[in-house]
């Protein structure tokens, strides 16, 4: 279960392992997610990250001690929209939210190094937000795709 109040809310630019920027572009009245090279002086799109604490059942071997850090993400341009994991076609999409985000909008935050994080789908364990063909998609973690699921959060 995810504990109600957010631990932290922060605004960051999201970039890939290869230093491409994740941006949100308005097309036909809807935002789409792009992954593209960003010029040195070009302003990067920001994401609003809301951090939550999640505890989970005792069978994990950690008893009540087991806690994960979850995030949900919105473009700063429109914080009523959430990044959503679509388990039907393994895509990442933006969805207009209800009062509270669904499970598909929560991602377990993995700190892979001091600089890079990964986002594991709460509702699809072992599946992460990754980069495929200049788009965000859901990918399973393996050695070949390791860098594809690494993202840098830069506080602007």
């Amino acid at each position: 279960s995810i504990q109600g109040t957010s631990l932290l809310t922060e605004s960051c630019a999201l970039s890939t392992y290869n230093d491409q920027s994740v941006s949100f572009v308005l097309e036909n009245g809807c935002y789409v997610i792009n992954v593209e090279d960003c010029g040195k002086n070009q302003e990067k799109d920001k994401v609003l990250l809301r951090y939550y604490e999640s505890s989970f059942p005792a069978q994990s071997g950690d008893g009540v001690d087991g806690k994960k850090l979850m995030v949900n993400m919105s473009p700063i341009k429109d914080t009523d929209i959430w990044l959503n994991a679509n388990d039907k076609d393994y895509s990442v999409e933006l969805q207009k939210g209800d009062v509270s985000p669904p499970d598909q909008a929560f991602f377990v935050l993995h700190k892979k190094s001091s600089d890079f994080v990964s986002f594991e789908c709460k509702n699809l364990p072992g599946t992460y937000i990754g980069v495929k063909d200049n788009q965000l998609a859901l990918v399973e973690e393996n050695d070949e795709s390791c860098n594809n699921i690494m993202f840098k959060l830069s506080k602007m």
């Epitope: 950690d62 850090l69 892979k112 506080k155």
Partner: antibody, heavy 122, light 107 residues
Framework: EVQLVESGGGLVQPGTSLKLSCLAS????????MTWIRQAPGKGLEWIAS????????YYPDSVKGRFTISRDDAKSTLYLQMNSLRSEDTATYYC???????????????WGQGTLVTVSS | DIQMTQSPASLSASLGETVSIECLAS??????LAWYQQKSGKSPQLLIY???RLQDGVPSRFSGSGSGTRFSLKISGMQPEDEADYFC?????????FGSGTKLEIK
């Protein structure tokens, strides 16, 4: 119950080496970042080394970089600190600590071992 | 490096008194700030994380607040068992850094 038990401390001469161990139990070891923190007698706390939950990344302050190495053996649920070229200023109680959340470093250190004393003196 | 300046260095308080300890960071960061209590001869114990979250099992007389560069720990109603050293720690940026500590004694 989460337990962290350090061992390997003792009296050593300057310039020599020592390896500390920390045996972890009561939690899924390979899901957590682990960290060594030390405290010189009568002084404050100093972060010494951290290792990612995968073991793929290690981090040190300048004061020990190149001399100390943190490592982990997930099969044995054990954390290590290899200390080389020891100096008198490395004299301290060394604590093994565990992060608050799976896969992460956010949220401080809720679990600490009892500490092991390292004395570097000729 | 983020320097954590903790004040006061020492403090004596009467039983039941409300006590505050402050930590000032050399640069602003998100709320990854923890407070620890260390009793004589013992390992430190986490009291507060995420600047204001009370760690499980910690009495509710302890509270944390602050953001950016200024953080504080408050003990509302000093108890005999609160006599200890207190440290703040930032986890936002490597190297991780601690405040130099506050020694809290009973008057």
């Amino acid at each position: 119950e989460v337990q962290l038990v350090e061992s390997g401390g003792g009296l050593v001469q300057p310039g020599t080496s020592l390896k500390l161990s920390c045996l972890a139990s009561g939690f899924t070891f390979n899901n957590y970042w682990m960290t060594w923190i030390r405290q010189a007698p009568g002084k404050g706390l100093e972060w010494i080394a951290s290792i990612t939950y995968t073991g793929g990344g290690t981090y040190y302050p300048d004061s020990v970089k190149g001399r100390f190495t943190i490592s982990r053996d997930d099969a044995k649920s054990t954390l290590y600190l290899q200390m080389n070229s020891l100096r008198s200023e490395d004299t301290a109680t060394y604590y093994c600590t565990r992060a608050n959340y799976y896969y992460n470093t956010y949220g401080g250190f809720p679990y600490w071992g009892q500490g092991t004393l390292v004395t570097v003196s000729s | 490096d983020i320097q954590m300046t903790q004040s006061p260095a020492s403090l004596s308080a009467s039983l039941g008194e409300t006590v505050s300890i402050e930590c000032l960071a050399s640069e602003g960061f998100s709320n990854d700030l923890a407070w620890y209590q260390q009793k004589s001869g013992k390992s430190p114990q986490l009291l507060i994380y995420a600047a204001s979250r009370l760690q499980d099992g910690v009495p509710s007389r302890f509270s944390g607040s602050g953001s950016g560069t200024r953080f504080s720990l408050k003990i509302s109603g000093m108890q005999p068992e609160d006599e200890a050293d207190y440290f703040c720690q930032q986890g936002s940026k490597y190297p991780l850094t601690f405040g130099s500590g506050t020694k809290l004694e009973i008057k």
